[in-house]
């Protein structure tokens, strides 16, 4: 009974001249796995590893396939014609064959540049307009505290001569720093300091296949 | 096309050690693997080794470590095979073949080098 | 090691006949089989690899067919230059293996 499943980085994005890894993981068996092809979207072979006889990389692509990581393969110096599916294919024993998918898309330079460009530093520039809202609401907060502190000392002193209307709207005032807080919490979510040795160390990813931050970080595939 | 041309035959007294040449034109040398396989006289094919043409690494059947060393020198397009410490049943043709496409069969074969051992 | 075993050894045949040569590997290799051809004197010659694929250059009437323990080789009209031995070799594990041969003989 076959009882194992193929995890794969799934849809993954990488741009011209990069390179990417693709990447099968066989989990949920204790099957040995004695060889792993690796086709391309037409079928037509990329690469053979043997357990015993190691790696086959088809001819025409050795100069820009490079074995590994694992049982996984690099593609490099892509090209347009690299978009499409690709499919790992797991031989083992006892349980028999396991076949996993991966799309790959390969985008133009220009326009991964722009992502590149632009999806990431709008991330830091939104989070550094929480950062910069969040200290003119600490600045307000703090002033108005001091103006506060200034007005006791002043009923103290007999001057009474200022309304309480001001002070009455300053306990709505802490509320913007707790959303605030929240809301500079949300972009450690998305590679942040919290995954930041995840998004960094790519390889080491793909080689340990922890697959939890997959959903969270899309670009984590692309090693252009 | 692809051609394979193997050195010429070899007579060599037990305990010497021969090396054969295989030079390799109409391909381009570094993305093939090259392959080598005996056959005594009168009996089947035996697979030696194998070794890629790009990376210099090679695989060797378990029963001819230390008996046969594999190189290649990409310059010339050119793979050997040193037997050593030859015995007399070490006799045998010697066949340089360009590994397949599509994984590790033999596509294209050298005409073969008769090894002969005899004191 | 895999053993793979040929049958029969040697056979014996007219022109125009239809040829049959089984290989049985001693386990599953899947569709990791080819075929070789040798005549006498001659180096050895591809005729079929991934147990059923035909190089460039080698004649239709050559086919192969089958998968995991059980191959075979078919001549479906044999001609005069056919006479030879054939060779299945596997080419899933270390070391790779041959068969011991089958020699096609005019009858």
């Known amino acids: 009974m076959m009882t194992g499943t193929i995890e794969t980085t799934g849809n993954i994005s990488a741009k011209k001249g990069g390179s990417v890894i693709l990447q099968c993981h066989l989990s949920s068996t204790m099957a040995q796995v004695t060889q792993v092809n690796w086709e391309q979207h037409d079928h037509s072979l990329l690469a053979i590893r043997n357990a015993e006889l190691g790696w086959h990389i088809y001819p025409a692509f050795k100069d820009r396939v490079a074995p590994g990581p694992g049982l996984g393969l690099t593609l490099q110096s892509l090209t347009m014609n690299d978009t499409g599916e690709y499919f790992c294919t797991y031989h083992t024993y006892p349980d028999g064959t396991y076949r996993g998918r991966i799309f790959l898309e390969v985008l133009e330079s220009s326009v991964a540049e722009h992502s590149a460009r632009f999806q990431i530093p709008l991330l830091g520039a939104m989070a550094m307009m929480l950062v910069v809202i969040c200290i003119a609401v600490i600045v307000v907060v703090v002033l108005a505290r001091k103006k506060k502190s200034l007005r006791i000392h002043s009923v103290e002193s007999g001057l009474q001569r200022k309304s309480t209307g001001q002070e009455e709207q300053i306990p709505s005032a802490p509320s913007p720093p707790g959303s605030c807080v929240q809301a500079e919490a949300a972009p450690a979510g998305l590679c942040g300091e919290q995954q930041g040795d995840d998004c960094a160390e790519l390889h080491d990813y793909f080689n340990v296949l922890s697959y939890r931050s997959l959903g969270s970080c899309s670009f984590f595939t692309e090693t252009g | 096309q692809v051609q394979l041309v193997q050195s010429g035959a070899e007579v060599k007294k037990p305990g010497a050690s021969v090396k054969v040449s295989c030079k390799a034109s109409?391909?381009?040398?570094?993305?093939?693997?090259m392959y080598w396989v005996r056959q005594a006289p009168g009996q089947g094919l035996e697979w030696i080794a194998f070794?890629?043409?790009?990376?210099?690494?090679?695989t060797y059947n378990q029963r001819f470590r230390g008996k046969a060393t594999l190189t290649v020198d990409t310059s010339i397009s050119t793979a050997y095979m040193e037997l050593s410490r030859l015995r007399s049943d070490d006799t045998a043709v010697y066949y340089c073949?360009?590994?397949?496409?599509?994984?590790?069969?033999?596509?294209?074969w050298g005409q073969g080098t008769l090894v002969t051992v005899s004191s | 090691d895999i053993q793979m075993t040929q049958s029969p050894s040697s056979l014996s045949a007219s022109v125009g006949d239809r040829v049959t040569i089984t290989c049985r590997p001693s386990e599953n290799i899947y569709t990791y089989l080819s075929w070789y051809q040798q005549k006498p004197g001659k180096a050895p010659k591809l005729l079929i690899y991934?147990?059923?694929s035909l190089p460039s250059g080698v004649p239709s009437r050559f086919s192969g067919s089958g998968s995991g323990t059980d191959f075979t080789l078919t001549i479906s009209s044999l001609q005069p230059e056919d006479f030879a031995t054939y060779y299945c070799q596997h080419h899933y594990g270390n070391p790779l293996t041959f068969g011991q041969g089958t020699k096609v003989e005019i009858k």
């Open positions: 109409g391909y381009t040398f570094t993305r093939y693997s």
């Open positions: 991934n147990a059923k």
């Open positions: 073949a360009r590994g397949g496409d599509y994984g590790w069969y033999l596509g294209v």
């Open positions: 070794i890629d043409a790009y990376s210099g690494g090679s």
